[in-house]
Amino acid sequence: APRGTQAEESPFVGNPGNITGARGLTGTLRCQLQVQGEPPEVHWLRDGQILELADSTQTQVPLGEDEQDDWIVVSQLRITSLQLSDTGQYQCLVFLGHQTFVSQPGYVGLEGLPYFLEEPEDRTVAANTPFNLSCQAQGPPEPVDLLWLQDAVPLATAPGHGPQRSLHVPGLNKTSSFSCEAHNAKGVTTSRTATITVLPQQPRNLHLVSRQPTELEVAWTPGLSGIYPLTHCTLQAVLSDDGMGIQAGEPDPPEEPLTSQASVPPHQLRLGSLHPHTPYHIRVACTSSQGPSSWTHWLPVETPEGVPLGPPENISATRNGSQAFVHWQEPRAPLQGTLLGYRLAYQGQDTPEVLMDIGLRQEVTLELQGDGSVSNLTVCVAAYTAAGDGPWSLPVPLEAWRPGQAQPVHQLVKEPSTPAFSWPW
């Protein structure tokens, strides 16, 4: 066929129509052609590109009894739930023998109420703290103008006059609702309503007021909480774990924390039942009727040392002439700190008391003055830490040494000539 005669020879007797509608619409485009001989497969084009995954059906009706007679071929393209990506120019394409034929175009357009691409989301914010909300809508038809509403009250005089995609809120002191309206030539669509819950601000200046071996007193400054009074504050303490280390931003402690509630005011709390001479991390959050604030950062604190809670154990004292042999074991009761040593005191019936610092040894040999005839000699031992002396043991009488008894080998400790302190009994 001559190169310029294609249009006249077109087999198409029905071209696609036009569809214009709102999102979600279902519609059908239809092509009809009349051909001689075997009917061809009809392909659909959108904006000049073959649709690889077209929802199309093809019906073929013979107009005669012979296979070489004419056929009517109808192809229908179904568009389900119309979207912006479906819009464009549609045509049918067929290959007949060695020739290509394209139908006249039809158009699919989208026109309706604005469609939200982004809507404001529920969120929590600290009182008097700035934040942003987002809203985005599109047509067609364009333009789409937005109007923000706070607690159902418009924030601008007319659509398009106030903030558009992003609304900056400098801060709230009460829980509020926000929505946005999208306006175009077809009408108005309203977004979901976002609830912005106002929580107390994070407490500030968490600090230690006083320390004792088993308790810490802490205080803090509450943050603003809007129109909602604080109902209580919650303090958490956790044993510091050198292996893990609680970083300032770490969301959760490495073990189950000790939790205490404080009624407010005052913004102060005494934490008891702690271990002495132990590092802790503490944090605080305050709660109103709307919910809790965020936690403060973890604050490292430490309980101070205490004195040992019990005397040394299993004290034995034996005498052999002018020498006395004393030994003992570490207290079973908590030391409440680092053991620095032991103090030992002994006294005879009519002699002054003698106090000695033994250091960390748990046995000592005493060189008694005179011929060793001092009667009713008794010995007491106490453990001590940096915080001071623990309780003294009950007086232990010095027993005569019997052959076969073990005897510690230690340098002799000479008895000082003057008493150093008054007796604990």
């Epitope: 190169r3 904006d47 000049g48 464009g88 060695h98 175009p105």
Partner: antibody
Framework: QVQLQQPGAELVKPGASVQLSCKAS????????INWVKQRPGQGLEWMGN????????NYNEKFKSKATLTVDKSSSTAYMQLSSLTSEDSAVYFC???????????WGQGTTLTVSS | DIVMSQSPSSLAVSAGERVTMSCKSS????????????LAWYQQKPGQSPKLLIY???TRESGVPDRFTGSGSGTDFTLTISSVQAEDLAVYYC????????FGGGTKLEIK
């Protein structure tokens, strides 16, 4: 009769821009892609890009993305290619061609000879 | 991008001889939906626009002499001129339109 008409020649100075035209007739202009092809003297054919007049959708050869801009005017059934920041390397014959979906017939314009010279 | 390679780049033959030229693509040009190979052969004479000879790899364009034959499928294609005539002096280009357009570098046919 399908025709693609192009001006025979254009003379422009280096650094300037030029808009080449391709006027279509004899068929439904909005239904077929228009392609642009460059041929430097004594060289082969280089596809530059194409445009679908129905939607103004375009594709470009990466090599010509910052050099060429394709547009159409549906009311006059004319396709345009604007070439910017011209140098002597842009001196060539530029053809427009209609793509019949990989089939027959396809039609080519006669080409516009662009000379970039001061 | 699809790359098209043509060989040889030139050849000289006497009138009446048979000539074949090759075109290879970097990926298959067979569209499984339309069941067609989107490869075309063009002839360009000096000072003229390219003229379509073959499309769909093997379909001869209307008015093209039957001494021109296209063959091949997928990635390997051949243009054969069964008996070269003096007027066949030209450059021959293959072109893929499977994905946009890409031309081969051309084969220059000279007559001895």
């Amino acid at each position: 009769q399908v025709q693609l008409q192009q001006p025979g020649a254009e003379l422009v100075k280096p650094g300037a821009s030029v808009q080449l035209s391709c006027k279509a007739s004899g068929y439904t202009f909005i239904s077929f892609w228009i392609n642009w092809v460059k041929q430097r003297p004594g060289q082969g054919l280089e596809w530059m890009g194409n445009i679908f007049p129905g939607s103004s959708s375009t594709n470009y050869n990466e090599k010509f993305k910052s050099k060429a801009t394709l547009t159409v005017d549906k009311s006059s059934s004319t396709a345009y290619m604007q070439l910017s920041s011209l140098t002597s390397e842009d001196s060539a014959v530029y053809f427009c061609a209609r793509d019949y979906y990989g089939g027959s017939p396809d039609y080519w314009g006669q080409g516009t000879t662009l000379t970039v010279s001061s | 991008d699809i790359v098209m390679s043509q060989s040889p780049s030139s050849l000289a033959v006497s009138a009446g001889e048979r000539v074949t030229m090759s075109c290879k693509s970097s990926q298959s040009l067979l569209n499984t939906r339309t069941r067609k190979n989107y490869l075309a052969w063009y002839q360009q004479k000096p000072g003229q626009s390219p003229k379509l000879l073959i499309y769909w790899a093997s379909t001869r364009e209307s008015g093209v002499p039957d001494r021109f034959t296209g063959s091949g499928s997928g990635t390997d294609f051949t243009l054969t001129i069964s008996s070269v005539q003096a007027e066949d002096l030209a450059v021959y280009y293959c072109k893929q339109s499977y994905n946009l357009w890409t031309f081969g570098g051309g084969t220059k046919l000279e007559i001895k």
